[in-house]
């Protein structure tokens, strides 16, 4: 269940997809990746207020219990709901290979 | 990839399964659930320090970028890796039904 997409905190403040530009050095990949030199990393960032993009029943429970016991139970967290694949040209023992990674770039986001 | 399970912050401080006792009232379920009256809710709580239980490549990227840009990129978050099913006896228009929910109780946790 994807609950409300209206952010009560104001535009762009709630859980959504952001793009962060990162170099191979930033990512700690310079020793094993040749290309790309820079990645447009898509990730899920933002607050998860009550029922905003609740991924499932567990997220709804978490919201309820966070309201009751905020020091014990954290609010739901903004995480990827799915991913976009990406290829890397990576060094191997013998040269290079083109490798596909399915879990690298967030495609869309939800709260859990 | 499940990375290190050693918590550098001290025992029990990092992402792991916790049990929180909650009543139907706590959960906001009193008007549609008859049983159980109380649920042992298992949920994922705790910090996600560098590479601790990293769910995938995305989590590893997030760790690297959080270290570089802590104000922009949040640390990975402790969320369910899988769920245990649970049945609820719930009210219906005509009486009651026994309904299974697959996404209600966390089974184990990882950082993402």
């Amino acid at each position: 269940a994807r609950n409300g997409d209206h952010c009560p905190l104001g535009p762009g403040r709630c859980c959504r997809l952001h793009t962060v530009r990162a170099s191979l050095e930033d990512l700690g990949w310079a020793d094993w990746v040749l290309s790309p030199r820079e990645v447009q990393v898509t990730m899920c960032i933002g607050a998860c207020p009550s029922q905003f993009r609740a991924a499932n029943m567990h997220a709804q429970i978490k919201t309820s219990l966070h309201r009751l016991k905020p020091d014990t139970v954290p609010a739901p967290c903004c995480v990827p709901a799915s991913y976009n694949p990406m290829v890397l040209i990576q060094k191997t023992d013998t040269g290079v290979s083109l490798q596909t990674y399915d879990d690298l770039l967030a495609k869309d986001c939800h709260c859990i | 990839a499940r990375n290190g399970d050693h918590c550098p912050l001290g025992p029990g401080r990092c992402c792991r399964l916790h049990t929180v006792r909650a009543s139907l009232e706590d959960l906001g379920w009193a008007d549609w659930v008859l049983s159980p009256r109380e649920v042992q809710v298992t949920m994922c709580i705790g910090a996600c320090p560098s590479q601790f239980r990293a769910a995938n490549m995305h989590a590893q990227i997030k760790t690297s970028l959080h270290r570089l840009k802590p104000d922009t990129v949040p640390a990975p978050c402790c969320v369910p890796a899988s769920y245990n099913p649970m049945v609820l006896i719930q009210k219906t228009d005509t009486g009651v039904s026994l309904q299974t929910y697959d996404d209600l109780l966390a089974k184990d946790c990882h950082c993402i």
């Epitope: 040749l34 290829v87 040209i89 690298l104 | -």
Partner: antibody, heavy 118, light 107 residues
Framework: QVQLQESGPGLVKPSETLSLTCTFS??????????VGWIRQPPGKGLEWIAH???????YFNTALKSRLTISKDTSKNQVSLKLSSVTAADTAVYYC??????????WGQGTLVTVSS | DIVMTQSPSSLSTSVGDRVTITCKAS??????VAWYQQKPGKSPKFLIY???YRYTGVPDRFSGSGSGTDFTFTISSVQPEDFAVYYC?????????FGGGTKVEIK
């Protein structure tokens, strides 16, 4: 496994538009870093890069041919199309499409011969 | 556009010999040079990436080196299946450009 197949008319008249399609399998053009390129080879001559299109729809063209070229993709059909307008005999060549991962062209189709003649 | 000048345009050699092909770029391309093999009636096969990195599955008798403007491709011990045309290509900037090719023939 990765496969690419070029298809085209075989024979085109001078001044007409050449339309080629590359149909591929084994990879997706929605994958970050993936592209499809076109390369041609006139009979008995060397290779000439024509154009390529990326996963994000960015397009790059051979400088000399740019004004005559159109490239497009249909990600759902796993196809890339190339159009070359106002053809002359100098455009007679075997046309190849190739999968690209950034600046690697690692898999090529078997090529399709296009002859420009009236 | 960057011009890639390959030499020689052809060479004759025997099985077991060492073969060296050179490629010169008209401007600095760092290490962004690839090498391809093409047999008659076939499509090119990708061999070397970024001057010196062998692609997956390419035998280690094939090697490359160089940076800036001068690049070398070597077959350490030519095998019967290696007789073909070899092309260099710069992948430093678009438009990507190829060398004219070197035909490796049996002596």
């Amino acid at each position: 496994q990765v496969q690419l197949q070029e298809s085209g008319p075989g024979l085109v008249k001078p001044s007409e538009t050449l339309s080629l399609t590359c149909t591929f399998s084994g990879f997706s053009l929605s994958t970050y870093g993936i592209g499809v390129g076109w390369i041609r080879q006139p009979p008995g001559k060397g290779l000439e890069w024509i154009a390529h299109i990326w996963w994000n729809n960015n397009k790059y063209f051979n400088t000399a041919l740019k004004s005559r070229l159109t490239i497009s993709k249909d990600t759902s059909k796993n196809q890339v199309s190339l159009k070359l307008s106002s053809v002359t005999a100098a455009d007679t060549a075997v046309y190849y499409c190739a999968r690209m991962g950034y600046d690697i062209m690692d898999y090529w189709g078997q090529g399709t011969l296009v002859t420009v003649s009236s | 556009d960057i011009v890639m000048t390959q030499s020689p345009s052809s060479l004759s050699t025997s099985v077991g010999d060492r073969v060296t092909i050179t490629c010169k770029a008209s401007q600095d391309v760092n290490t962004a040079v690839a090498w391809y093999q093409q047999k008659p009636g076939k499509s090119p096969k990708f061999l070397i990436y970024s001057s010196s990195y062998r692609y997956t599955g390419v035998p280690d008798r094939f090697s490359g080196s160089g940076s800036g403007t001068d690049f070398t491709f070597t077959i350490s011990s030519v095998q019967p299946e290696d007789f073909a045309v070899y092309y260099c290509q710069q992948h430093y900037s678009t438009p990507w450009t190829f060398g004219g090719g070197t035909k490796v023939e049996i002596k």
